[in-house]
Interface confidence: low
């Protein structure tokens, strides 16, 4: 007999990493006909919807109208058939960028190189930090983490082509408040035709994804949920 | 920055009516649930109502159901508290607060109302 | 409504000592629970939420510690500007519930 459902699925949109003072929606995303979703920041209840009809609605939104410091963290959500609950979905890290100060983002010997060069980045933040984060632009959204004093270095070995793209980094004062993202910094690798074919660079992500981050949710997000309207609120699981 | 001020205390006798107001600045206001908690003179807090961002929802602690209001206008940013049927026990400073997840993040400087013959 | 008592309701310390202060809920309330400070005249302000998040801006010389019935708050090192009141809360279910408060005095 099945005792729990699936585990819903989790994301930020249109980004897990959400500037201070800007606007995320969380969304989670179980099965139809589900009568309840549960959000959970940090192992408590945070926010719980009910969709109206739920046999028509497999997804709700959690709506955070100006990201800050207070709603960084680790989030998860579980929803409920009847009276049978989900596994936990897995957990979504929200970050919040834009904090303090911007770093620098070098690239040694240069932007410009060719395939298999030895390439090292150097983030650099004079304030008080010592983990960075280097991301390359992408679907894919890959974080190297480096430490250092003020400076951290990340060595990406012998470069291919599928190294090609736009690098950005941050300072990061927990592991989910980090600072303005450097200057970009493109990264261009000449190689022959074949690798160059083998080895696309990541799609990127839409142009506001980067330096803007996020346009004004839609006002359908905007839902009042009127969270005290619930008697769910203290049955934590 | 976030700014709450609220206005509108004063003395007033038993059976009376009040109206407070509370004008919010520095966040998105109708996205935000709001708050009044009050603080009668050397006591602790008491939370008195709560409203959603719509102004859709409203709850009350017990000992104010029924003769107090709680509203607000989301295109003058501004909170209301209208009270009546006053009475002594109703006599502390009020505070305007905006609520996060059940938790209050920010406070306004509070008004105060004397309810007295 | 879930009550929350605190103790002690008042105390006394001098500038550099540690302080701790306890609060109880009656009945379990996971981990949702706030401290704030409040100074004479002036409006309480928020420290602590989630049982041991740090709001920002707050000093690191405070801390949360806690779940289910029992919490506490701890000033490590007391401050001249810590000398105030501070009040816990319940913000597991409504109605969002105080406890009377502790007075810190300067010994």
């Known amino acids: 007999q099945q005792q729990t459902l699936p585990k819903p699925f989790i994301w930020a949109e249109p980004h897990f990493m959400v500037p201070k003072e800007k606007q995320v929606t969380i969304c989670c995303q179980g099965n139809y006909g589900a009568v309840e979703y549960q959000l959970h920041f940090e192992g408590s209840l945070f926010a719980v919807d009910r969709p109206k009809p739920p046999e028509r609605i497999n997804k709700v939104q959690f709506y955070i109208p100006d990201m800050n410091s207070r709603m960084a963290g680790q989030y998860s959500c579980i929803y409920r058939v009847g009276e049978l609950w989900s596994e936990p979905s897995n957990l979504l890290d929200l970050v919040v960028t834009e904090m303090y100060d911007t770093p620098t983002l070098s690239v040694h010997p240069g932007p410009e190189v060719i395939s298999g060069e030895k390439v090292t980045f150097y983030c650099r933040l004079d304030t008080a930090t010592s983990m960075f984060l280097l991301l390359k632009e992408g679907r894919s959204s890959h974080v190297q983490r480096g430490y250092g004093k003020v400076q951290a270095e990340f060595p990406l070995g012998p470069v291919t082509t599928a190294h090609r793209g736009t690098y950005r980094c941050f300072g990061s004062y927990n592991n989910h408040a980090w600072s303005f993202p450097s200057e970009p910094v493109k990264l261009l690798v000449t190689g022959d035709i074949e690798n160059t074919s083998l080895a696309p660079e990541d799609p990127t992500f839409p142009a506001d994804t980067w330096g803007t981050y996020l346009l004004t949710t839609e006002t359908g997000l905007q839902k009042d949920h009127a969270l005290w309207d619930h008697t769910a609120q203290n049955l934590l699981r | 920055e976030v700014q709450l001020v609220e206005s509108g205390g004063g003395l007033v006798q038993p059976g009376g009516s009040l109206r407070l107001s509370c004008a919010a600045s520095g966040f998105t206001f109708s996205s935000y649930e709001m708050n009044w908690v009050r603080q009668a003179p050397g006591k602790g807090l008491e939370w008195v109502s709560y409203i959603s961002g719509s102004g859709g929802s409203t709850y009350y602690a017990d000992s104010v159901k029924g003769r107090f209001t709680i509203s607000r206008d989301n295109s003058k940013n501004t909170l209301y508290l209208q009270m009546n049927s006053l009475r002594a026990e109703d006599t502390a400073v009020y505070y305007c607060a905006r609520v996060w997840r059940f938790y209050f993040d920010y406070w306004g400087q509070g008004t105060l109302v004397t309810v007295s013959s | 409504d879930i009550q929350m008592t605190q103790s002690p309701s008042s105390l006394s310390a001098s500038v550099g000592d540690r302080v701790t202060i306890t609060c109880r809920a009656s009945q379990g309330i996971s981990n949702a629970l706030a401290w704030y400070q409040q100074k004479p005249g002036k409006a309480p302000k928020l420290l602590i939420y989630?049982?041991?998040r740090l709001e920002s801006g707050v000093p690191s010389r405070f801390s949360g510690s806690g779940s289910g019935t029992d919490f506490t708050l701890t000033i490590s090192s007391l401050q001249p500007e810590d000398f105030a009141t501070y009040y816990c809360q319940q913000h597991y279910s409504t109605p969002p519930t105080f406890g009377q408060g502790t007075k810190v005095e300067i010994k």
């Open positions: 989630a049982a041991s």
